[in-house]
């Protein structure tokens, strides 16, 4: 059975520009090293938002300057993207790669449409 990656269809970012979603994969093998990448698709252009490699049983670690954080539990990854603004609205795709041991396997989710609404500025109070 091929590797399947599931993620929610739609997520609404919080007023603070934070969006969280779960990326879950059905693994065809017993991977010990997994790479998770978040891709953003907008206007048919695909760009990498963030990526992290983790050892099964260990924590997911993104680079210090990454806008992503996450935790892992078995074949499930909880992803959080912060610092989002209205212009960042788009389809966020979860890509999972089983890196080790060989063989390598690839799985790509259908994407989560993240809607970001910039907060209205507070009116001045007298």
């Amino acid at each position: 059975k091929a590797m399947h990656v599931a993620q929610p269809a739609v997520v609404l970012a919080s007023s603070r520009g934070i969006a969280s979603f779960v990326c879950e994969y059905a693994s065809p093998g017993k991977a010990t090293e997994v790479r998770v990448t978040v891709l953003r698709q907008a206007d048919s252009q695909v760009t990498e938002v963030c990526a992290a490699t983790y050892m099964m049983g260990n924590e997911l670690t993104f680079l210090d300057d990454s806008i992503c954080t996450g935790t892992s539990s078995g074949n499930q990854v909880n992803l959080t993207i912060q610092g989002l603004r209205a212009m960042d609205t788009g389809l966020y795709i979860c890509k999972v790669e089983l890196m080790y041991p060989p063989p390598y396997y690839l799985g790509i989710g259908n994407g989560t449409q993240i809607y970001v609404i910039d907060p209205e500025p507070c009116p001045d109070s007298d």
Epitope: A2, H4, V46, M99, Y100, P103, Y104, I108
Partner: antibody
Framework: GVVQPGRSLRLSCAAS????????MHWVRQAPGKGLEWVAV????????YYADSVKGRFTISRDNSKNTLYLQMNSLRAEDTAVYYC?????????????WGQGTTVTVSS | TQSPSSLSASVGDRVTITCRAS??????LNWYQQKPGKAPKFLIY???ILQSGVPSGFSASGSGPDFTLTISSLQPEDFATYYC?????????FGPGTKVDIK
């Protein structure tokens, strides 16, 4: 180049026009009059390498990101390794989809 | 496997090439075009997504194990050999190719 069976050869592929250190890179070969055969891939940072069974243990893929160069060290060469060897860039979304290809270099293994 | 291994067609013809995977590779199939003496050109990835710059006359579909590449109206520059390739798992194997030549 022409090389005798059992000997070694190193291929180089100098990349330009893109951020080399951000992409996985592949070697693909094509024997005369035959189809394409995937040979090896190396991840953007050199952390992972995978090989076709036909070259495993004989060929080594490597890269030098400071020189924007991909290498293929070929040892214990055989007549069946005679082919045009292409380097190719892995795509962002699908690392094994090769979206940019080099012009190819011919390797002939013959005594 | 790819079928047919070769076909003869005329300019304006609709051409369909089939690729069958020997294992479940989900949607992870790519298509390439190669002309004699030239490097392959990347056409399609993840079964149906056209690479930017590829003419809209090319389309593809499928999900393991059967995939198809269609050229809606064959142009003179489309006479070439077409290869499918799976990108789901190592080794990243290519199909044997389909040669499209002039009738």
């Amino acid at each position: 180049g022409v090389v005798q069976p059992g000997r070694s050869l190193r291929l180089s592929c100098a990349a330009s026009g893109f951020t080399f250190s951000s992409y996985g890179m592949h070697w693909v070969r094509q024997a005369p009059g035959k189809g394409l055969e995937w040979v090896a891939v190396i991840w953007y940072d050199g952390s992972h390498k995978y090989y076709a069974d036909s070259v495993k243990g004989r060929f080594t893929i490597s890269r030098d990101n400071s020189k924007n160069t991909l290498y293929l060290q070929m040892n214990s060469l055989r007549a069946e390794d005679t082919a045009v060897y292409y380097c190719a860039r892995g795509a962002v979304v699908v690392p094994a989809a090769m979206d940019v290809w080099g012009q190819g270099t011919t390797v002939t293994v013959s005594s | 496997t790819q079928s047919p291994s070769s076909l003869s067609a005329s300019v304006g013809d609709r051409v369909t090439i089939t690729c069958r995977a020997s294992q479940n590779i989900s949607r992870y199939l790519n298509w390439y075009q190669q002309k004699p003496g030239k490097a392959p050109k990347f056409l399609i990835y993840v079964a149906s997504i056209l690479q930017s710059g590829v003419p809209s006359g090319f389309s593809a579909s499928g999900s393991g194990p059967d995939f198809t590449l269609t050229i809606s109206s064959l142009q003179p520059e489309d006479f070439a050999t077409y290869y499918c390739q799976q990108s789901y798992s190592t080794p990243f194997t290519f199909g044997p190719g389909t040669k499209v030549d002039i009738k």
